[in-house]
Interface confidence: low
Amino acid sequence: SIPWNLERITPPRYRADEYQPPDGGSLVEVYLLDTSIQSDHREIEGRVMVTDFENVPEEDGTRFHRQASKCDSHGTHLAGVVSGRDAGVAKGASMRSLRVLNCQGKGTVSGTLIGLEFIRKSQLVQPVGPLVVLLPLAGGYSRVLNAACQRLARAGVVLVTAAGNFRDDACLYSPASAPEVITVGATNAQDQPVTLGTLGTNFGRCVDLFAPGEDIIGASSDCSTCFVSQSGTSQAAAHVAGIAAMMLSAEPELTLAELRQRLIHFSAKDVINEAWFPEDQRVLTPNLVAALPPSTHGAGWQLFCRTVWSAHSGPTRMATAIARCAPDEELLSCSSFSRSGKRRGERMEAQGGKLVCRAHNAFGGEGVYAIARCCLLPQANCSVHTAPPAEASMGTRVHCHQQGHVLTGCSSHWEVEDLGTHKPPVLRPRGQPNQCVGHREASIHASCCHAPGLECKVKEHGIPAPQEQVTVACEEGWTLTGCSALPGTSHVLGAYAVDNTCVVRSRDVSTTGSTSEEAVTAVAICCRSRHLAQASQELQ
Amino acid sequence: QEDEDGDYEELVLALRSEEDGLAEAPEHGTTATFHRCAKDPWRLPGTYVVVLKEETHLSQSERTARRLQAQAARRGYLTKILHVFHGLLPGFLVKMSGDLLELALKLPHVDYIEEDSSVFAQ
């Protein structure tokens, strides 16, 4: 039987006969920035090239127990998890190792920067196929390390990093907090977040997904045939680096944005027990466990979307929060969320030639989050149409009036501190699916896009009596692009997308004395490619 | 902090005469900022990454590094350029006293300076 972690990332289709193609990942080179490694271990012999790069601080002066001499332990194990003959994810991937961590597993930001620069220079001198860089390390938040990762990512390199083992918000650590890096948390065989002594896996909005990271069997540096079990977010990141190598080998032209979307799309959804996370982090932390795609061939032209949460705005009266999509992604909708319910909505606005999602805090509010729905929409032409507050009893409306443009998301933003409980009509007049409806005192913003083969529809779920949570999901074959709430009254905490489900949260009914006049409707906008063949033809 | 680099003195003396005539005022624009690790035990004071503005060329990075050394020498401080970055980010890694940060932040082309810090296997 295969180890639990390999079984967990393997789609059922593979499990019946063989785990995966024996040459998986063969077109990809994976760089490992870690400790020294035992390159002649039978798991990785001939698969890992030890570069001459070494930039490590001296070991601490104190005399350590004999385990301290295991200089190769961490790196050897990770190389085995990525590409090991018996226990590796991408058995065909070739690797190159750079030593940036000393025998105590310690390195420096500067040494890591010089290592990343070495990789970039190697890439320029001898361009090869797709590159994956595995960074199984973490330090405190570092602007410069994040910037270097951003530059390398923009040069077409896929960076995968450990979320960190500090049972803390991953955004406080680098390179985990770099948006361009794929940041991986760790789960165990029971799909619980991994506990490591008194600490454990990091969590939060800077984590992209989780992967197996407890009791992972891999190459041991004790001898050339030994195996050992190790745990940590490094092991989790190594799984994702291996999966990325498999995906890139099958589709070498994938961009970082496409790869990240596929990793999210093929992950197991909603299997992690979120009770382990601090309450305020649960909504921000992705409930995703990485898995290989069911086929090593491409996913075809599918509409892939992901949810990106902003940092918290902070509590000041005029505080705002901004959520951004990656350079290759389109912002298809924008929503906001506040635990106190005191917010002034959200809007899509241009910043540096790209749309961003901005959420606005309200007086007395504890702060807001902006939530962007970021999608891969090749050759898309998107724009935002805005209607100012109507003041009319029927509420404010805006629609996509350009020929061939479809509605992908609705946002509303208001200047008044507290919207009244006025309830606009929930149902749109027939024959006008391309419009957003909102509170009469709010500005309404419609995201309107034209893209080959794209069609969208609005789906609503209204509950007559107030509920703390209302959801509406898109059916199989459709992708959620927009998520908003009707009406935009103050007892609505906000709306956000979780995978293909639109979630609208309201204040605890027992404490607000809400009436049925304030019933809430979750509004989802679901899109798809009308015809895959047609779409691929139009793209050519 | 002890220093085993005996070549400091010689290097700095050579640089003094070469760079003394350079103006010390920064370019017009925003002031450069200083960053350091929020986790105190992980800080590595005495080593700094000086990050230059995006379009700075390698020759300008080297010139800025030399200018820092010359100005530091005039104030009686030894500095050592450990690495000049190019390819990903323009800038350089310098071993110097924290007393020189104010001076370094005023150099032309400087975007920000970050104190080095530790990273750990996870």
Epitope: D72, I217, D222, F227, S229 | -
Partner: antibody, heavy 118, light 113 residues
């Protein structure tokens, strides 16, 4: 007190089965690989099997492969050796030994005698 | 498998004298990545389990008297007792832990002359 205590030995007929146990105390059991080492009467030491700290990896001497199964219960801090299809040459004192995690044995139990005879 | 061969099979030494036991492995047990020899020495007194004396070929386990020392590298190793005491009467085994199967030497019986 740091110690290992074996039990379960005895007389068994050829072809029979026996299950040995080793109770560990005084150290973090889950953090260490564990081993069974045997010693035939008047003979030297013979490594039998090892199991990783997590229980995920096992190794066996060729002479017992397919007949013996090593396992551990972390909640009970106990190591086991299930011995099937026993032969006369399996007669020995069986020692439970804690692994330093390198492969040398830094703590041994007092042993339990297994006699395979008709 | 790595075969470990000890010599002599038995040894009689006077109290206070030096005792030397040799161990040879059929292949090197030196691991180049950390420059360690994966070799240990054990002492087994009559009716007792073995006890680890030396690991990494030359590092004494805590609590082991300093009259015991180990040396050698690669394939040839030596255990030395600098001044034999009565309580040192035992059988001594070397063991390689470079790779599984872990293997022991056949043992050297040390007696007092």
């Amino acid at each position: 007190e740091v110690q290992l205590v074996e039990s379960g030995g005895g007389l068994v007929q050829p072809g029979g089965s026996l299950r040995l146990s080793c109770a560990a105390s005084g150290f973090t059991f889950n953090n260490y690989a564990m081993n069974w080492v045997r010693q035939a009467p008047g003979k030297g030491l013979d490594w039998v099997s090892t199991i990783s700290g997590s229980g995920g990896t096992t190794n066996y001497a060729d002479s017992v492969k397919g007949r013996f199964i090593i396992s551990r219960d972390s909640s009970k801090h106990t190591l086991y050796l299930q011995m099937n299809s026993l032969r006369a040459e399996d007669t020995a004192v069986y020692y439970c030994a804690k692994d330093s995690n390198w492969g040398n044995f830094d703590l041994w139990g007092r042993g339990t005698l297994v006699t395979v005879s008709s | 498998d790595i075969v470990m061969t000890q010599s002599p099979d038995s040894l009689a030494v006077s109290l206070g004298e030096r005792a030397t036991i040799n161990c040879k492995s059929s292949q090197s047990v030196l691991y180049r990545s950390n420059n360690r020899n994966f070799l240990g020495w054990y002492q087994q007194k009559p009716g007792q389990p073995p006890n680890l004396l030396i690991y990494w070929a030359s590092t004494r386990e805590s609590g082991v008297p300093d009259r015991f020392s180990g040396s050698g590298s690669g394939t040839d190793f030596t255990l030395t007792i600098s001044s034999l005491q009565a309580e040192d009467v035992a059988v001594y085994y070397c063991q390689q832990y470079y790779t599984t199967p872990y293997t022991f030497g056949q043992g050297t019986k040390l007696e007092i002359k």
